[in-house]
């Protein structure tokens, strides 16, 4: 039994770090493998993660990590019974994938302006709370070509756009994702999408 693709890990910088790897053949990850992880810190204990299958030869492990701080470094040992298959390390702050934003809401009652709001996925005392920026994706259910991305580079989790920038009388969907430049994170997953019917008063034409 060998590791074909070494584990790569990302952290949500709050509770879960996810490590994925591939074996050289079909593997029952949960019965055959264990991923041990330990904070590099005096007297810290080793924790065991039981991996799950992720495709035929793929495995994924969700590591519980609380109180992550930027200096934290973990050793990782992948075991098959008594055999050490791989040894590595992981610094959560250098491999961050933020949590997805939540509670995306479209407010359509603000005089021909669409107000999109969502929730920051971190509590105020988490370092990422004040460092997230967002991308909002809006698309038409009727027209696949009507697909746009708005970059929200300020901290407030909201976006205002004129309803008239979208077509009237049709349904749109929106979703949002986050990233943090300070940690050079990857993008989060998209939030669940929300749907609304876009309608606004066309201005009278002047002749």
């Amino acid at each position: 039994m060998k590791v074909l693709q070494e584990p790569t890990c990302v952290s949500d910088y709050m509770s879960i770090s996810t490590c994925e790897w591939k074996m050289n053949g079909p593997t029952n990850c949960s019965t055959e493998l264990r991923l041990l992880y330990q904070l590099v810190f005096l007297l810290s204990e080793a924790h065991t993660c039981i991996p799950e299958n992720n495709g035929g030869a793929g495995c994924v492990c969700h590591l519980l990590m609380d109180d992550v701080v930027s200096a934290d470094n973990y050793t990782l040992d992948l075991w098959a019974g008594q055999q050490l298959l791989w040894k590595g390390s992981f610094k959560p702050s250098e491999h961050v994938k933020p949590r997805a934003p939540g509670n995306l809401t479209v407010h359509t009652n603000v005089s021909d302006t669409l107000l999109l709001t969502w929730s920051n996925p971190y509590p105020p005392d988490n370092y990422l709370y004040n460092h997230l920026t967002y991308a909002v994706n809006i698309w038409s259910e009727n027209d696949p070509a009507d697909f746009r991305i708005y970059n929200v580079t300020y901290l407030e989790p909201s976006l205002r756009i004129a309803a008239s920038t979208l077509k009237s009388g049709i349904s749109y969907r929106a979703r949002v994702r986050a990233w943090a430049q300070c940690y050079n994170t990857t993008w989060s997953e998209w939030s669940p999408s929300t749907k609304w019917h876009n309608s606004y008063r066309e201005p009278f034409e002047q002749h």
Partner: antibody, heavy 119, light 107 residues
Framework: EVQLVETGGGLVQPKGSLKLSCAAS????????MNWVRQAPGKGLEWVAR??????????YYADSVKDRFTLSRDDSQSMLYLQMNNLKTEDTAMYYC???????????WGQGTTVTVS | DIQMTQTTSSLSASLGDRVTISCSAS??????LNWYQQKPDGTVKLLIY???SLHSGVPSRFSGSGSGTDYSLTISNLEPEDFATYYC?????????FGGGTKLEIK
């Protein structure tokens, strides 16, 4: 082996005070966040409070039902967790569990609990 | 606050059965869901964290699944020690909240 032993429960009158203690052993106490969770007689589990580790400035969080009445603290040198409960109400009657936290709310080891009766 | 609902408060099953316990959240919790077992003597254990990850030392007959607002815990091939009360808990947002519990009883 992780062990969490709660003490300090007992019978107290409404508006009275009580201090619960939790002695932790078998793990690196100072790098873990800790919680108290309670269970009223015949009811489900209710999260009460949480304290983070020194690396996160011992930040504390409380359920709205106990905010401004309960105070959570820890002594890393003694591997002890404390819950000071003031202005107790009859609805605080419950079994109180000391719980280790391994990931912002994933509570992996629980003590046996200590009973608080407000009557 | 996020409300967690376990619609079935009690469930009867026989040894060797496969049972599924359901839990729903009042909003999307992005898989930040745990399952706990409480024995009649009050002992509480973490079984599953982050929807489907088996906690160390928990038998593989326990499994978890779900996404969005709907989650479930499945116990296959019930053993005598599995008759207990099971709670789901979200750790997406503070305050962390538990479902009301599902008591698994012997038929």
């Amino acid at each position: 082996e992780v062990q969490l032993v709660e003490t300090g429960g007992g019978l107290v009158q409404p508006k009275g005070s009580l201090k619960l203690s939790c002695a932790a052993s078998g793990f690196t106490f100072n790098t873990n966040a800790m919680n108290w969770v309670r269970q009223a007689p015949g009811k489900g589990l209710e999260w009460v409070a949480r304290i983070r580790s020194k690396s996160n400035n011992y930040a504390t969080y409380y359920a709205d039902s106990v905010k401004d009445r309960f105070t959570l603290s820890r002594d890393d040198s003694q591997s002890m967790l404390y819950l000071q409960m003031n202005n107790l109400k009859t609805e605080d009657t419950a079994m109180y569990y000391c719980v280790r936290d391994r990931g912002w709310g994933a509570m992996d080891y629980w003590g046996q609990g200590t009973t608080v009766t407000v009557s | 606050d996020i409300q967690m609902t376990q619609t079935t408060s009690s469930l009867s099953a026989s040894l060797g059965d496969r049972v599924t316990i359901s839990c729903s959240a009042s909003q999307d919790i992005n898989n930040y869901l745990n399952w706990y077992q409480q024995k009649p003597d009050g002992t509480v254990k973490l079984l599953i964290y982050y929807t489907s990850s088996l906690h160390s030392g928990v038998p593989s007959r326990f499994s978890g699944s779900g996404s969005g607002t709907d989650y479930s815990l499945t116990i296959s091939n019930l053993e005598p020690e599995d008759f207990a009360t099971y709670y789901c808990q979200q750790f997406s947002n503070l305050p962390w909240t538990f479902g009301g519990g599902t008591k698994l009883e012997i038929k």
